[in-house]
Amino acid sequence: FNISGCSTKKLLWTYSTRSEEEFVLFCDLPEPQKSHFCHRNRLSPKQVPEHLPFMGSNDLSDVQWYQQPSNGDPLEDIRKSYPHIIQDKCTLHFLTPGVNNSGSYICRPKMIKSPYDVACCVKMILEVKPQTNASCEYSASHKQDLLLGSTGSISCPSLSCQSDAQSPAVTWYKNGKLLSVERSNRIVVDEVYDYHQGTYVCDYTQSDTVSSWTVRAVVQVRTIVGDTKLKPDILDPVEDTLEVELGKPLTISCKARFGFERVFNPVIKWYIKDSDLEWEVSVPEAKSIKSTLKDEIIERNIILEKVTQRDLRRKFVCFVQNSIGNTTQSVQLKEKR
């Protein structure tokens, strides 16, 4: 199809070589058409456009994305670029930063239902550049955390070095939907709830004498609880003696609850004490058996192929540790009578 009639938008993605960040393109079809598509309609229900030339579908994934090869070859279906570029609803997600993502991307409805619809398309010229070291040293991260129940803020990474006074007007999106009231380089959250978690996009316009570009950044915002102030506790074994049968195989499970920590490095291991000696046992990998917002339960088993008389003289110790401290629980084996 002829893309000369498509509306054009220029975007700039300046990525940090230090972080694993992603980027998105929205299918910004001309305003009346957009309302049929991506549900990012800026119109209030009362502001119905006078005419709707594009009779699109309500199916959110009903747009087609293409990539325009730089050598002038025909347009390529974006699905050829899978899994580096992924379409979700009307949004194109770029999973890996790199200058090779620079180029032209075209979106249009899949279903062309009237002569007007042929020109119902958008061409996005994307320029991708690595961030120069000269730019801001302390720019906001592309992964930001908000503490549940407290106040917090979400900063636009590409503008975080500028003061609110000198910052240009910013357009914010959350999970692809326009946040129409937010216009500054920082979103202030009075009280953080779980629903504040999501993918935020901030856009602002940068102009030079020749043209203007939309500078875009993507921020993944996580809602978290505060770091625990407690060392882990062992939920199992509870008893310090265990009745066993000699000659039979035995599995002893150690289950421990670890409170949430942003930097989470849990330790759970088994060791054996035999008179004055003690040594760590090679046991199967630990596994997470339950994970909630506040804590995680991790299990690690020690397996004895068969219980011997010598095992009855030993103590089997489960050791767990986080950044706050450690806890141990020892088990003495006792022959079943």
Partner: nanobody, 117 residues
């Protein structure tokens, strides 16, 4: 923290079928993300086999197109992979993970699929 737990792997003969499931621990995280199935064959790197967007759009690598079907149930916080016409080269550990979103990079512990006669 997001926990993903896969199930449904096993030993199957060439041409057979399996259905993998993956349960997530947080619904707020699950529904807005592009979720996917990765696999890692012995001695090879991990590859993204298929993904599904929050709106239901699906993608597959060429080697599984027409044989594998990905689906999701947001109300149950569960991701599925229906694998038909399985081949020996599909043998791998299959992981469910977040492809795009807040917990991008989070993976389950994996479920082994072995295709052998």
């Amino acid at each position: 923290q997001l926990q993903l737990l896969e199930s449904g792997g096993g030993l199957v003969q060439p041409g057979g079928s399996l259905r993998l499931s993956c349960a997530a621990s947080r619904s707020i995280t699950f529904s807005h993300n592009v979720m996917g199935w990765y696999r890692q064959a012995p001695g090879k790197g991990r590859e993204l086999v298929s993904s599904i967007g929050s709106g239901g759009s699906t993608n597959y690598v060429d080697s599984v197109k027409g044989r594998f079907t990905i689906s999701r149930d947001n109300s149950k916080k569960t991701l599925y992979l229906q694998m038909n016409s399985l081949r020996a080269e599909d043998t791998a550990v299959y992981y469910c993970g977040v492809v795009v979103g807040v917990y991008r990079g989070s993976l389950g512990q994996g479920t082994l699929v072995t295709v052998s006669s």
